[in-house]
């Protein structure tokens, strides 16, 4: 026989991940006869949702299904028509839809019945939508980015695929920043947790894995930043609001009843004089990290150490991913070479805050203006959840890598989710047997 | 306690279309989900589609897709399913059936008396 | 879509015994299982939801088990009106989708 290849038996998965801020979906695909062998799933596609995120359309369920059509009909051309029926589609709401859980079940489980039979009218093999928890979203993190980054691979390579990557099989840890939670998730070096409420086993590829992992719900940028508005108008002598976190000559006016729609502005609520009140932006970098570090209670910790708000944190160690909005923020930013040292972060954003609000807007004219003014504080959020939440240091900076894709595929929560809802991590090693993988006859 | 009251049997003509009523009575219509199920002679149960009333949101068996519409309206409490492109093989009882509760609760607790569908050259 | 499996199709039963019906799902449901018995000429009548919870109105003799992928419905002593067909339904995902029916008939 001739040495003709095979055609190549694809498969393909969807994963919505429909976060407080906006929905995406992500099309992955991957050799059907190699599907537990480690990094051969790979992204083919991401469609971000035009809107809000989901939980934004309690008040408005019924326009649901037109939110989710454009990117679905795109996963429809995406993927062969004969691989339609059997492509599994999953939705996996976050921290948004946890807060609105919060408010009213009833609300939130309205929003995911919409979403769910709106889902189902395609030709895909849909699966559900459903919350998941902050601890699997801190897992499927650290799952997905190990994956792509070959650390789960027993083969050893001779050659890197990133340039951060190094040959040994230490995992990395990961570190995701949503609109409204933040995750660390990592392998400790002392394998006994003085928190079990933080420690998850996984056998993964023949290997056991220890990890810790925290989901401090509220502590997205979006949610942080309502945090901060509400913590700081409380001491405001009138309706205006001076804010180091916002660019000299930046104006904006913010109406009170957003500002505690929230449940994560609950504790700083309380009755004001006024219905409105005006952010003024000063720009300074330095009182605004101050007023960030605010809403970090570091007074009370019953463990050995610990992050934030009593919650347990082992010492960091090895390298760690920053991913999501870790990596959105600060590659706007321009900070997200190897080389930036935490001091070199730290003085550019002073430079950064303090430039005027005019000036930004137009050395970034094609930002949207909401975005745009966030920066500032967003950067600051950053550094400061880093180094003072999490005890990174100085030293410890550079093990932080500052990323978007790996190998085309997007970090995040949705591939490591994927792929445990598809049994496509074995615990154990498969047996590659040399003929096994053959595309040639 | 709520009944639901269906439209009269029909005879139809292969290609024709057909559209079956059910109206809600002794109960709120609007915030449970109506389904319509249908049952050949001497077969099982087979599930069509589903709209919840206060929103007009269907959904529908991949099966049926682009012959089945089912619509509602609130103002008389009643539902409609109209199936299209009728052939000899979609003879059958025609049952709406009320979903009970929300997200992941559509067990059906109250049927309507059904509605037998014939569909003869 | 979720495959719903009955077995057996036909159980010939006397009156006063046990039944046991059987309902396997291709995929986990949960607890997300409804039963239903049809009577001919008759529409569908809800038992059990949620897997093991009896609707308004049932019998006691009517009980549900099982989680998953394995649910049973056990009639602990049939009365002549418990003779007809009963269907398994999952409701977790979008199709709804039924077994096959189990016909209990008079031994």
């Known amino acids: 026989t001739q040495n003709k290849a095979l055609p190549e038996n694809i498969k393909y998965g969807i994963v919505l991940d429909a976060g407080s801020s906006h929905t995406s979906l992500y099309i992955y695909k991957w050799p059907a006869e190699k599907e537990n062998d480690t990094g051969v799933v790979h992204q083919v596609e991401e469609c971000r949702v035009k809107g809000p995120g989901i939980s934004k359309y309690v008040q408005k369920v019924n326009e649901i299904g037109i939110y989710l059509t454009d990117c679905m009909e795109r996963a429809r051309e995406v993927i062969p028509r004969s691989q339609h029926q059997e492509t599994p589609v999953y939705l996996g709401a976050t921290a948004g839809m946890r807060l609105l859980r919060m408010e009213s079940e009833e609300l939130a489980d309205r929003v995911l019945d919409v979403v769910e039979r709106s889902l189902s009218n395609y030709p895909f093999d849909f699966q559900g939508a459903r919350i998941i928890t902050g601890q699997e979203e801190g897992a499927y993190g650290w799952i997905t980015i190990n994956y792509l980054l070959g650390k789960f691979s027993q083969k050893t390579r001779w050659f890197s695929i990133v340039p951060y990557e190094t040959n040994n099989q230490e995992t990395f840890g990961a570190l995701d920043l949503g609109g409204a939670s933040t995750q660390i998730t990592f392998v400790p070096q002392n394998q006994t947790t003085e928190s079990p409420d933080n420690a998850l086993q996984f056998r993964l590829y023949g290997k056991d894995y220890n990890v810790y992992t925290h989901s401090f719900l509220c502590y997205g940028k979006d949610q942080a930043l309502w945090q901060k508005l509400a913590k700081d108008i409380q001491v405001a002598s009138n309706e205006i609001l001076r804010d180091p976190c916002f660019h000299p000559g930046y104006k904006k006016v913010v109406n009170v009843s957003d500002l505690y729609k929230t449940p994560c502005t609950k504790r700083f609520e309380m009755t004001l004089p006024f219905q409105q009140f005006e952010i003024q932006g000063i720009g300074n970098y330095q009182q605004c990290h101050q007023s960030v570090l605010e809403l970090f209670n570091t007074s009370y910790c019953p463990y050995s150490q610990c992050a934030f708000n009593g919650i347990f944190l082992p010492p960091l160690q090895g390298d760690f991913g920053a991913f999501s909005a870790f990596y959105f923020v600060m590659n706007f930013l321009n900070l997200t070479s190897e080389k930036v040292s935490q001091e070199k972060v730290t003085e550019m954003m002073k430079k950064f805050c303090s430039q005027p609000w005019e000036e930004i807007k137009t050395s970034y004219a094609g930002v949207k203006e909401k975005y745009l003014s966030e920066y500032c504080f967003s950067g600051t959020y950053i550094l400061s959840l880093l180094l003072q939440g999490y005890h990174f240091t100085a030293d410890s900076w550079e093990h932080i890598h500052f990323i978007g894709k790996i190998q085309g595929s997007d970090a995040g929560w949705t591939l490591g989710y994927m792929l445990n809802l598809t049994n496509m991590i074995p615990a154990e090693q498969p047996l590659s047997t040399p003929l096994s993988h053959s595309t040639y006859v | 306690q709520v009944q639901l009251v269906q439209s009269g049997a029909e005879v139809k003509k292969p290609g024709s279309s057909v559209k079956v009523s059910c109206k809600a009575s002794g109960g709120t219509f609007e915030s449970y989900g109506i389904s319509w199920v249908r049952q050949a002679p001497g077969q099982g149960l087979e599930w069509m589609g589903s709209?919840?009333?206060?929103?007009?949101?269907?959904n529908y068996a991949q099966k049926f897709q682009g012959r089945v519409t089912i619509t509602a309206d609130e103002s008389t409490s009643t539902t409609y399913m109209e199936l299209s492109s009728l052939r000899s093989e979609d003879t059958a009882v025609y049952y709406c059936?009320?979903?009970?509760?929300?997200?992941?609760?559509?067990?059906?607790?109250?049927w309507g008396q059904g509605t037998m569908v014939t569909v003869s050259s | 879509e979720i495959v719903m499996t009955q077995s057996p199709a036909t159980l010939s039963v006397s009156p006063g015994e046990r039944a046991t019906l059987s309902c396997r799902a291709s995929q986990s449901v949960g607890s997300n299982l409804a039963w239903y018995q049809q009577k001919p000429g008759q529409a569908p009548r809800l038992l059990i939801y949620?897997?093991?919870t009896r609707a308004t109105g049932i019998p006691a003799r009517f009980s549900g088990s099982g989680s998953g992928t394995e649910f049973t419905l056990t009639i602990s002593s049939l009365q002549s009106e418990d003779f007809a067909v009963y269907y398994c339904q999952q409701y977790l995902l979008w199709p709804l989708t039924f077994g096959g029916g189990t016909k209990v008939e008079i031994k």
């Open positions: 949620g897997a093991s």
């Open positions: 059936a009320r979903e009970s509760g929300g997200y992941r609760d559509h067990r059906l607790d109250v």
């Open positions: 709209i919840i009333p206060e929103f007009g949101i269907a």
